[in-house]
Interface confidence: medium
């Protein structure tokens, strides 16, 4: 129950990519505003996005403090212009979010091929180690820093002149593959956390092809 002119938020949804994490909800407010609170299982509630008319709240700063914690958020509804007003139960209406564990659930962002270098019949393909907003000792950690061995990359590569794809995997950010001399190849990579049950794979990176300026070629 609550006041007649406020409605509780619903469809609370976590949207998270590479730990950039936003809580979204409905409805668009009519004569009401929202405040969000976030907590770990054992922690105190912390308020964010005070008295907002938005239907989203960026909670990245809170969840990056420990991406292996499990978080719960709740969205409070207040009458616009009278945020002290409460529901008949003596508190504002609120709705709880699903639990969210960033390490297990954040989506893997689209990776980028940083470079490729051909030396004879070998090509070294390097994936950009994307920076996250997770900090340690005042520095931002990369995706590899955070996930360590849990993160692998899959490389898809094929001759420019054909469509038959080959694959390679690495648990670093580099691939060393064999290619046919004199052939141009195209590459795409995908970030994968094989042991996840949800959000296991990123979208594929943009395709990069030999003969374009990303690469460097040294014939031996």
């Amino acid at each position: 129950s609550g006041t007649t002119n406020t409605v509780a938020a619903y469809n609370l949804t976590w949207k998270s990519t590479n730990f950039k994490t936003i809580l979204e909800w409905e409805p668009k407010p009519v004569n009401q505003v929202y405040t969000v609170q976030i907590s770990t299982k054992s922690g105190d509630w912390k308020s964010k996005c005070f008295y907002t008319t938005d239907t989203e709240c960026d909670l990245t700063d809170e969840i990056v403090k420990d991406v292996k914690q499990t978080y719960l958020a709740r969205v409070f509804s207040y009458p616009a212009g009278n945020v002290e007003s409460t529901g008949s139960a003596g508190e504002p209406l609120y709705e709880n979010s699903p639990e969210f564990t960033p390490y297990l659930e954040t989506n893997l962002g689209q990776p980028t091929i940083q470079s490729f270098e051909q030396v004879g019949t070998k090509v070294n393909v390097t994936v950009e180690d994307e920076r996250t907003l997770v900090r340690r000792n005042n520095t931002f950690l990369s995706l590899r820093d955070v996930f360590g061995k849990d993160l692998i990359y899959t490389l898809y590569y094929w001759k420019s002149s054909s469509s038959g794809k080959k694959t390679a995997k690495t648990n670093t950010n580099e691939f060393l593959i064999d290619v046919d001399k004199g052939e141009n190849y195209c590459f795409s990579v995908q970030a994968v956390i094989p042991s996840r049950t949800v959000n296991r794979k990123s979208t594929d990176s943009p395709v990069e092809c030999m003969g374009q300026e990303k690469g460097e070629f040294r014939e031996i």
Epitope: K41, S42, D66, K68, Q69, T70, T101, Y103, L104, K149, D150, I152, K169, T170, N171, I193, P194, S195, R196
Partner: antibody, heavy 118, light 107 residues
């Protein structure tokens, strides 16, 4: 259903080697690190090392690094742990365990008892 | 390597009692702690991961808490089938290390 089935008990003489197998089923074998943990009689758990079944890359506990070798056979979804230069204090139950996302060991084999005795 | 100190090494409690086991890490392990149950002659079973998350199928009477160096494992109402040895393990930094174990018995 995830299952890790280990080879049977072994009795070895000091100085010999033992190779324990762990056959995985019910999941993608190459998607999870396989770990080996041992437990001496009446004692606690001791981590020996882990292997990435996808690449064959291994990490060892420094204590065992000179004597333990971890391998996998992707064609049979089997992980192996070989311990050489056995001594009486290596008498223990040896477990394989699948490492879950983020570190914990979610599935364990039934254990293989290795007895080292002259 | 990170040392894990678990206490007590054994305890005796009555059915229905609240049982608490503590584990102290020699350096911060963030939330990188797991708890296992091992019954005599059986393999260990994962109960808690990331310090406070119950693993699939684990009854709600088992819980974990803590952060950094100090961690607690609780059985809210001890049942006869909970007789076992319980181990903490840090999975924050290799080599992964275990506590010495706590043997739980029924009075």
């Amino acid at each position: 259903e995830v299952q890790l089935v280990q080879s049977g008990a072994e009795v070895k003489k000091p100085g010999a080697s033992v190779k324990v197998s762990c056959k995985a089923s019910g999941y993608s074998f190459t998607g999870y690190y396989m770990n080996w943990v041992r437990q001496a009689p009446g004692q606690g758990l001791e981590w020996m090392g882990e292997i990435n079944p996808s690449t064959g890359g291994s990490t060892y506990n420094q204590k065992f690094k000179a004597r333990v070798t971890l391998t996998v056979d992707q064609s049979t979804n089997t992980a192996y742990m070989e311990l050489s230069s056995l001594r009486s204090e290596d008498t223990a139950v040896y477990y394989c365990a699948r490492r879950e996302l983020g570190g914990p060991f979610g599935y364990w084999g039934q254990g293989t008892t290795v007895t080292v005795s002259s | 390597s990170i040392q894990m100190t678990q206490s007590p090494s054994s305890l005796s409690a009555s059915v229905g009692d609240r049982v608490t086991i503590t584990c102290k890490a020699s350096q911060s392990v963030s939330t990188g702690i797991a708890w296992y149950q091992q019954k005599p002659g059986k393999s260990p079973k994962l109960l808690i991961y990331f310090a406070s998350n119950r693993y699939t199928g684990v009854p709600s009477r088992f819980s974990g808490s803590g952060y950094g160096t100090d961690f607690t494992f609780t059985i809210s109402s001890l049942q006869p089938e909970d007789i076992a040895t319980y181990y903490c393990q840090q999975d924050y930094s290799s080599p992964w290390t275990f506590g010495g174990g706590t043997k739980v018995e029924i009075k």
